[in-house]
């Protein structure tokens, strides 16, 4: 069977400060089992933006219902964007593990740029 792919269709997204940004992400398979996380940046310094498994992420809403059976859409919307939100966002699939989940595959990233709010 084909190995799961993480698809982030947009290389870049530009929004005005104060608006919401939609970052798209889709999986090609339900396997392996494990959560999705979104990060801004890569490597050790990356910021956790959303964790499907746990935590409270008040500015993030999921575009589709992630708990829905057979859901493959893991797109998110981030509200009230500020200049500090600019950066490259990665949708990352984790494989369920014990005790910790293991990073399995990352999308190619979507660069979010923030325009000054129109006056």
């Amino acid at each position: 069977e084909d190995e799961l792919q993480v698809i982030q269709p947009e290389k870049s997204v530009s929004v005005a400060a104060g608006e919401s940004a939609t970052l798209r992400c889709a999986m090609t398979s339900l396997i392996p089992v494990g959560p999705i996380m979104w990060f801004r940046g890569a490597g050790a310094g990356r910021e956790l933006i959303y964790n499907q498994k746990e935590g409270h992420f008040p500015r993030v809403t999921t575009v589709s219902e992630l708990t829905k059976r057979n859901n493959l859409d893991f797109s998110i919307s981030i509200s009230n964007i500020t200049p500090a939100d600019a950066g490259t966002y990665y949708c990352v699939k984790f494989r369920k593990g014990s005790p910790d989940d293991v990073e399995f595959k990352s999308g190619a990233g979507t660069e979010l740029s923030v325009r000054a709010k129109p006056s």
Epitope: R46, N80, T82, A84
Partner: antibody
Framework: DVQLVESGGGVVRPGESLRLSCAAS????????MNWVRQAPGEGLEWVSR????????DYAESVKGRFTISRDNSENTLYLQMNSLRAEDTAVYYC????????????WGLGALVTVSS | ETVLTQSPATLSVSPGERATLSCRAS??????LAWHQQKPGQAPRLLIY???NRATGIPDRFSGSGSGTDFTLTISSLQTEDSAVYYC??????????FGGGTKVEIK
């Protein structure tokens, strides 16, 4: 309930070192950025340092850069501040503060730990 | 760097009266402004975030308004327990996170 409890404060001489700890409970510690904020006697609040949720990304105020190191142990739900080459002007109450999301305000504060640097 | 200027430095208000505190930013911070209350000998406590939203458990006599560069914290009917220093914090541009110099609210 969210609880943040600092420890490790005390009296040291200029040039000496001290390590502060902040024990966190009541929330998913590994999902949130954390900060240290200090308050000199009779003065206002001064942000000192921030660490991202995973621990690999750090930021410092210019006044402490190169002398202070922030770190965290997500398995122990603990935040640290290693303070080296302490100066009289570092005398303050040091608070650990939880960040609401990756780019946000501080929604919970610890009770503080007093650090006194005096010869 | 964004500088936050709070005024007045001290505000003396009688119980039951309205207290109005100001925070002005040197450049726009959108709605990314929080207010914290610090009572004597205590840690700060979040009151208001995103300029207008009350934090969990904060009485409705506290309200925030403003956007851009000019913000106001209003205590509609001052209680004796509201005696404290109030700090504004911006989180539009960072690092560094910036706090205002504080406004001390005294009970007449």
């Amino acid at each position: 309930d969210v609880q943040l409890v600092e420890s490790g404060g005390g009296v040291v001489r200029p040039g000496e070192s001290l390590r502060l700890s902040c024990a966190a409970s009541g929330f998913s510690f590994s999902s949130y950025a954390m900060n240290w904020v200090r308050q000199a006697p009779g003065e206002g609040l001064e942000w000192v340092s921030r660490i991202n949720s995973g621990g690999g990304g750090t930021d410092y105020a210019e006044s402490v850069k190169g002398r202070f190191t922030i770190s965290r142990d997500n398995s122990e739900n603990t935040l640290y501040l290693q303070m080296n080459s302490l100066r009289a002007e570092d005398t303050a109450v040091y608070y650990c503060a939880k960040q609401y999301d990756w780019n946000g305000f501080f929604d919970y504060w610890g009770l503080g730990a007093l650090v006194t640097v005096s010869s | 760097e964004t500088v936050l200027t709070q005024s007045p430095a001290t505000l003396s208000v009688s119980p039951g009266e309205r207290a109005t505190l100001s925070c002005r930013a040197s450049q726009t911070v959108g709605s990314k402004l929080a207010w914290h209350q610090q009572k004597p000998g205590q840690a700060p406590r979040l009151l208001i975030y995103d300029a207008t939203n009350r934090a969990t458990g904060i009485p409705d006599r506290f309200s925030g308004s403003g956007s851009g560069t000019d913000f106001t914290l209003t205590i509609s009917s001052l209680q004796t327990e509201d005696s404290a220093v109030y700090y504004c914090q911006q989180y539009y541009y960072w690092p560094p996170y910036r706090f205002g110099g504080g406004t001390k609210v005294e009970i007449k």
